[in-house]
């Protein structure tokens, strides 16, 4: 297993609709054809997997149908979008990249993107 540098923004504020997008960029040492991207969430010292996708270079990322993540790839960059976020989902979202094929296997883990999520203010009651 060889180490690889992964860069991602330090802080992102999700939209009022609970959507956060960020780029995860990796320094590929070789010509990988198969890449796996995993998003991990760290909050209060606990790490959980948010979503994961394996893709062939030049093709779209395919997450599971019920995944809250979508993404596109361009060269050594992956543009990740996480939706359905609420204030309680605020936390550090870490991008993990694995170059699966061809060998050698490379692994890179970013420092994480702190995603702040603000629940929208409830609309004031109105009389009809």
């Amino acid at each position: 297993c060889k180490a690889m540098h992964v860069a991602q923004p330090a802080v992102v504020l999700a939209s009022s609709r609970g959507i956060a997008s960020f780029v995860c960029e990796y320094a590929s040492p070789g010509k990988a054809t198969e890449v796996r991207v995993t998003v991990l969430r760290q909050a209060d010292s606990q790490v959980t997997e948010v979503c994961a996708a394996t893709y062939m270079m030049g093709n779209e990322l395919t997450f599971l149908d019920d995944s809250i993540c979508t993404g596109t790839s361009s060269g050594n960059q992956v543009n990740l979008t996480i939706q359905g976020l609420r204030a309680m989902d605020t936390g550090l979202y870490i991008c993990k990249v694995e170059l699966m094929y061809p060998p050698p296997y490379y692994l890179g883990i970013g420092n994480g993107t702190q995603i702040y999520v603000i629940d929208p203010e409830p609309c004031p009651d109105s009389d009809f």
């Epitope: 923004p9 330090a10 802080v11 992102v12 504020l13 999700a14 939209s15 009022s16 997008s21 960020f22 909050a43 209060d44 204030a87 605020t90 550090l92 994480g112 702190q114 702040y116 603000i118 629940d119």
Partner: antibody, heavy 117, light 108 residues
Amino acid sequence: QVQLVQSGAEVKKPGASVKVSCKASGYTFTSYGISWVRQAPGQGLEWMGWISAYNGNTNYAQKLQGRVTMTTDTSTNTAYMELRSLRSDDTAVYYCARVGANWFDPWGQGTLVTVSS
Amino acid sequence: EIVLTQSPGTLSLSPGERATLSCRASQSVSSSYLAWYQQKPGQAPRLLIYGASSRATGIPDRFSGSGSGTDFTLTISRLEPEDFAVYYCQQYGSSPWTFGQGTKVEIK
């Protein structure tokens, strides 16, 4: 080193607007956020809101909603805070601060805004 | 809105003494999102502690933070002359982000 430098002091009349700038250096501007905090004379710190320089999304304190606008210019690594319909109780030192994963650091040197007729 | 209440309002101590500052939240705050700042007259605030207990870069080890839930503490083990200032706690786990009203540490 990481530094935030703010624009100079302003004197404004009630009802006017003020726009304070905060120029960042020493780090990747779009990787972080910028928060704005004010401090009235002899008082404590009041959080006004913040902007994510990465995507331009903003979160404002409710009491200032509708009067405040925070923006960034990523070509010059500068954040701006505009406050409209100024009142005498808006007289304060206005600070910008870099928002990290779980901290505000560093802070700008502060900009004194005086609202007086 | 989470209200942070700091106590005491003023702490009168001599250099070399231990200072214990309290910050109590009206609702539970994730310790990841609790910070302490120091402010001297005419200066901008300076980050001391983030994540409730992690010292910021360049902050001497006489400053320490602890606590969880609704009760947080900043301790200065031995006061130096330059430590006399106003200290603020802040939470940024729940919007709106809020500050405590401050504790002034003054020379006795």
